[in-house]
Amino acid sequence: AFGISGVQKYTRALHDSSITGISPITEYLASLSTYNDQSITFALEDESYEIYVEDLKKDEKKDKVLLSYYESQHPSNESGDGVDGKMLMVTLSPTKDFWLHANNKEHSVELHKCEKPLPDQAFFVLHNMHSNCVSFECKTDPGVFIGVKDNHLALIKVDSSENLCTENILFKLSET
């Protein structure tokens, strides 16, 4: 595993990455839960959506999220003009016309109604930390991930590779 400088190195070029094509390469409808199997739920309150992290009662239906996968070219670190590789970026939409957004000033995750093309704040780099867990890194703020804080989703700064496996930034996707 690489140290802090490594994390900074791999995140630095995120700002420069370009999404190739406007349409997603695939879309996937899944329920989202935390590493500890709490469900991510969405509730309409006062004409806006709130996001909760909670234990569901037995047989209670899980909320589904539409994940749209986009391919993003990553500039080469070495030459500066080549492409070093590709990343997967996702947008997350729990209901029509609403998308998860990173509010970097408030360190919060919010649902916003918007039209396409979506702003950069709605895109998250998809990481697999484990074979069955994913993490979501802000396109607009490299090194910052969606995480769980006080039973809500929040933006959490990850400053070393060891912390990439911290449970509060790990999520499970399930089709059921």
Epitope: A1, T26, M87, L88, N128, E175
Partner: antibody, heavy 122, light 107 residues
């Protein structure tokens, strides 16, 4: 240009050990999941081991679990496969492969080494 | 484990003919399905990923389709260089599994 070069194969006796290496070049090694896949002579492909891009997670099928260990040295851009308690059914060409995307397992394996042959026989 | 049943096991096709190979999964999964071509004595080469995405540098006569449990690879207009073994692979759930392969020969 992405290159993966395996080494370390050869003829060994059942019950012994062998360590394979894969030297990677042409890409940022520590951003990718890496995987070993093998192919017995005249047979199909079999997934053997995967390691996360951070090195923090390793995964194996039941056929090699407890006998094989995948590891990586990011400073040397090298992937390893330590094989212990080798059996005749481990005879195969072993390929080192790289994932399609940074940080991620999705999208198959676009890059393969030339393979290294391991023969387990008495 | 997800079993990948690939058919047919072997296939002979004339030059210019359209060929299809199918992969049937024992359970449904997201479309993390790849197709590989392996020529005799060579390493496998990725043709299709995400069930239908063409890998860079692969001729457009190759196409992939399907979702859930049923996936297929189509070669529209068989060429001499397409004589090879073809494998499907699911990457959705560990352990990763491959189809048993299809040997494609020229008639």
């Amino acid at each position: 240009e992405v290159q993966l070069v395996e080494s370390g194969g050869g003829l060994v006796q059942p019950g012994t050990s062998l360590k394979l290496s894969c030297l990677a070049s042409g890409f940022t090694f520590n951003n990718y999941w890496m995987t070993w896949i093998r192919q017995a002579p005249g047979k199909g492909l079999e997934w053997i081991a995967s390691i996360t891009y951070t090195g923090g997670g390793t995964y194996y099928p039941d056929s090699v679990k407890g006998r094989f260990t995948i590891s990586r040295d990011d400073a040397k851009s090298t992937l390893y496969l330590q094989m212990n308690s080798l059996r005749s059914e481990d005879t195969a060409t072993y390929y080192c492969t790289r994932a399609n995307y940074y940080y991620n397992t999705y999208g198959g394996f676009p890059y393969w080494g030339q393979g290294t042959l391991v023969t387990v026989s008495s | 484990d997800i079993q990948m049943t690939q058919s047919p096991a072997s296939l002979s096709a004339s030059l210019g003919e359209t060929v299809s190979i199918e992969c049937l999964a024992s359970e449904g999964f997201s479309n993390d399905l790849a197709w590989y071509q392996q020529k005799s004595g060579k390493s496998p080469q990725l043709l299709i990923y995400a069930a239908s995405r063409l890998q860079d540098g692969v001729p457009s006569r190759f196409s992939g389709s399907g979702s859930g449990t049923r996936f297929s690879l189509k070669i529209s207009g068989m060429q001499p260089e397409d004589e090879a073994d073809y494998f499907c692979q699911q990457g959705s759930k560990y352990p990763l599994t491959f189809g048993s392969g299809t040997k494609l020969e020229i008639k």
